[in-house]
């Protein structure tokens, strides 16, 4: 497995009082049984609300690399291939669960963390506020 | 804490050979530091590729209930509010980490699992295959 510079303050896995702590098997089982799940694949280019993917890396987190979507335009692409500003490209955001090494650099001690990621973009009708 | 009918085969938290196992603090930390993350909120109704949320339940998983996006139409909604079948509504999928009790019914032993979920839909230009 991976060797991590060990923090001398790492908690003892056998400490009965280690707060709100459980054993987690990291031999990750992949339930994506569909042999061709056809993930968002090339949708980021073909969408009427296209997006770019940006790499976010953090070695103290699992997964350490998360790809974030950023919508390319404020508006959406119309049938002529132009940006239509009467519509809005917006990110679809989702909280995901990650593991963070805590204390830092401990090879076998983690904390669950929720982070908000943008998964892709969709085209929506804008909310128009009418001023009296 | 909670009383769970205990599986006699639960691994010993102190077993040095328990495979690829780490201590995880379940006090979930919220890293959503953005002051206005504006999650997907009402986009499922306002999108040109609207979606419904469908319930998927599994009592041995956390979260036990996962609401999955299913695109409402094969096509996309045009400016007149009609479905345009020259475009396609497609699901944006994301792999997420969930926790599974393993062995089942063990109160303090879990396994990380990756599952693919549809978090929303986007409108894409179809791939047209021309037959010679």
């Amino acid at each position: 497995g991976i060797t991590i510079p060990r923090n001398p303050g790492c908690p003892n896995s056998e400490d009965k009082n280690f707060p709100r702590t459980v054993m987690v098997n990291l031999n990750i089982h992949n339930r994506n049984t569909n042999t061709n799940p056809k993930r968002s694949s090339d949708y980021y280019n073909r969408s009427t609300s296209p997006w770019n993917l940006h790499r976010n890396e953090d070695p103290e987190r699992y997964p350490s690399v998360i790809w974030e979507a950023k919508c390319r335009h404020l508006g959406c692409i119309n049938a002529d291939g132009n940006v239509d500003y009467h519509m809005n490209s917006v990110p679809i955001q989702q909280e995901i669960l990650v593991l963070r090494r805590e204390p830092p650099h401990c090879p076998n001690s983690f904390r669950l963390e929720k982070i908000l990621v943008s998964v892709g973009c969709t085209c929506v009708t804008p909310i128009v506020h009418h001023v009296a | 804490g909670i009383t769970i009918p205990r599986n006699p085969g639960c691994p010993n938290s102190e077993d040095k050979n328990f495979p690829r196992t780490v201590m995880v603090n379940l006090n979930i930390h919220n890293r959503n530091t953005n002051t206005n993350p504006k999650r997907s909120s009402d986009y499922y109704n306002r999108s040109t590729s609207p979606w419904n949320l469908h319930r998927n339940e599994d009592p041995e998983r956390y979260p036990s209930v996962i609401w999955e996006a299913k695109c409402r139409h094969l096509g996309c909604i045009n400016a007149d509010g009609n479905v345009d079948y020259h475009m396609n509504s497609v699901p944006i999928q994301q792999e997420i980490l969930v926790l599974r009790r393993e062995p089942p019914h063990c109160p303090n032993s879990f396994r990380l699992e990756k599952i693919l979920v549809s978090v929303g839909c986007t409108c894409v230009t179809p791939i047209v295959h021309h037959v010679a």
């Epitope: 909280e95 929720k114 | 909120s41 956390y62 209930v65």
Partner: antibody, heavy 126, light 107 residues
């Protein structure tokens, strides 16, 4: 349809303890949490604490820390709230509420209280 | 600890009138705010979740808006059965506390 049914009214003396039960039916008990909320006569709602059934994790409001114990039994799908060292200020209606913990619309685990028990009146009087 | 304040404390309203109740958080809570209705001698009932999401079985005259620190519950066309106390509740961070409530009665 989830239903939460609480135990009956209790009359206690100062210094005693009270244990209120909340029997859940419908839905997967291990999948959600149960929170306890109290309401003194003519007052607002006060969150006391809650349990995430899947992990058995309990959180308490600081005001009640050391005096309240929240537990749950998955085999009987019942949650319990025990409050010790009762005083007249603890006279209130005690409610259990379901905390869905669902992966929904951008949230990894939701925390709205979507179902409530009917309430248990606890009267503390000498 | 996040503190929620509501205004007004009390509102006396004529049927069919529009009612607006506001809830302010002492710090940013994203859209992690919920609204409950409590009628006399009844348990609270969830009306709106996550600031603006309607709840199944709740009449469409109830709507919510806002994010960050300022939130609004609107009742469009009050009906006699809407009399009761309305509470906001945050689930952004522990403890998951409630606002002090707004009592609505019918003139």
């Amino acid at each position: 349809e989830v239903q939460l049914v609480q135990s009956g009214a209790e009359v206690k003396k100062p210094g005693e303890s009270v244990k209120v039960s909340c029997k859940a039916s419908g839905g997967s008990f291990s999948g959600y949490g149960i929170s306890w909320v109290r309401q003194a006569p003519g007052q607002g709602l006060e969150w006391m604490g809650g349990i995430t059934n899947f992990f058995g994790i309990v959180d308490y409001a600081q005001k009640f820390q050391g005096r309240v114990t929240i537990t749950a039994d998955e085999s009987t799908t019942t949650a319990y709230m025990e409050l010790s060292g009762l005083t007249s200020d603890d006279t209130a209606v005690y409610y259990c509420a379901r905390d869905p913990n669902e992966f929904w619309n951008g949230y990894y685990a939701t925390h709205d209280f979507d179902y409530w028990g009917q309430g248990t009146t606890v009267t503390v009087s000498s | 600890e996040i503190v929620l304040t509501q205004s007004p404390d009390f509102q006396s309203v004529t049927p069919k009138e529009k009612v607006t109740i506001t809830c302010r958080a002492s710090q940013n809570i994203d859209s992690d705010l919920h609204w409950y209705q409590q009628k006399p001698d009844q348990s609270p009932k969830l009306l709106i979740k996550y600031a603006s999401h309607s709840v199944s079985g709740v009449p469409s005259r109830f709507s919510g808006s806002g994010s960050g620190t300022d939130f609004t519950l609107t009742i469009n066309g009050l009906e006699a059965e809407d009399a009761g106390t309305y509470y906001c509740h945050q689930s952004y961070s522990l403890p998951f506390n409630f606002g002090p409530g707004t009592k609505v009665d019918i003139k």
